[in-house]
């Protein structure tokens, strides 16, 4: 999917608003300073295009975040402020039905989800330069 | 150019009712999410009831269900809010504010209807006092 039609002041009021604490809540007892954020985004498109891809694929280690209540906001959020995006989803969501596994919040997740902070905070601040 | 017009406010005693009108034009109504919000003296703004549209979907604030109704008339381009067993605590200056896609994805909308900053259109507010 191409994220550069998306309204990206909405997606970004949408996390300021409530997507931002929920990841804090994930994230909670862990140390800000505990992982590195080695997953970066060069504009906002491309930001979205991470956080879609960090947020739904299953990687070694994190099988699903899918679940979790930052993931549906994440999603409901893409779909409502994305034209088209809903549409794209459809098999991805049957293929990801039926691969699905039970919650576990593993160290893996917890890296995963501390990337996902730094990549939300880029996208709200897209005229930074990147270092 | 867009305009929310409320009216329907007043002074009402605890235990009554009012209804309140939201008026839309300038923008295509039947697409637009349509939401209730209320702010009482040194509060934040509230979420209170949400009407899509396009498909008819609410949504309510834990605090109003039961007792208040939102529903919407396509053909006259406005949206009311139907308030009964009014209390004290409901006393606010109510306004209607519009957004151009929750209204067309009432499902995922149920995360994010009752967050002002998400909303493109505001009326000026109408007053709702609850006093005996």
């Known amino acids: 999917y191409d994220f550069t039609n998306c309204d990206f002041e909405k997606i970004k009021a949408a996390y300021l608003s409530t997507i931002s604490k929920d990841l804090i809540t994930y994230m909670s007892g862990t140390k800000s300073t505990e992982f590195n954020n080695t997953v970066s985004c060069s504009n906002r498109p491309h930001c979205l295009t991470e956080i879609q891809s960090l947020t739904f694929n299953p990687t070694a280690g994190c099988a699903s975040l899918a679940k979790e209540m930052f993931a549906m906001k994440t999603k409901a959020a893409l779909a409502i402020w994305c034209p088209g995006y809903s549409e794209t989803q459809i098999n991805a969501t049957q293929a990801m039905k039926k691969r699905r596994k039970r919650k576990v919040t593993t160290n893996k997740c917890l890296e995963q989800v501390s990337q996902l902070q730094g990549l939300w905070r880029r996208f709200n601040r897209p005229l930074l330069k990147q270092q | 150019e867009v305009q929310l017009l409320e009216s329907g406010g007043g002074l009402v005693q605890p235990g009554g009712s009012l209804r309140l009108s939201c008026a839309a034009s300038g923008f295509t109504f039947g697409d637009y999410a349509i939401t209730w919000f209320r702010q009482a003296p040194g509060k934040e703004l509230e979420g209170v009831a949400y009407i899509s549209n396009f498909d008819g979907m609410t949504y309510y604030a834990d605090s109003v269900k039961g007792r208040f109704t939102i529903s919407s008339d396509n053909s006259k381009n406005t949206v009311y809010l139907q308030m009964n067993s009014l209390r004290a605590e409901d006393t606010a200056v109510y306004y209607c504010?519009?957004?151009?896609?929750?209204?067309?994805?009432?499902?995922?909308?149920?995360?994010?209807?009752?967050?002002?900053?998400?909303?493109?259109?505001w009326g000026q507010g109408t007053l709702v006092t609850v006093s005996s």
């Open positions: 504010a519009a957004e151009g896609r929750m209204g067309t994805h009432s499902r995922d909308s149920v995360y994010f209807w009752a967050f002002s900053a998400l909303y493109d259109y």
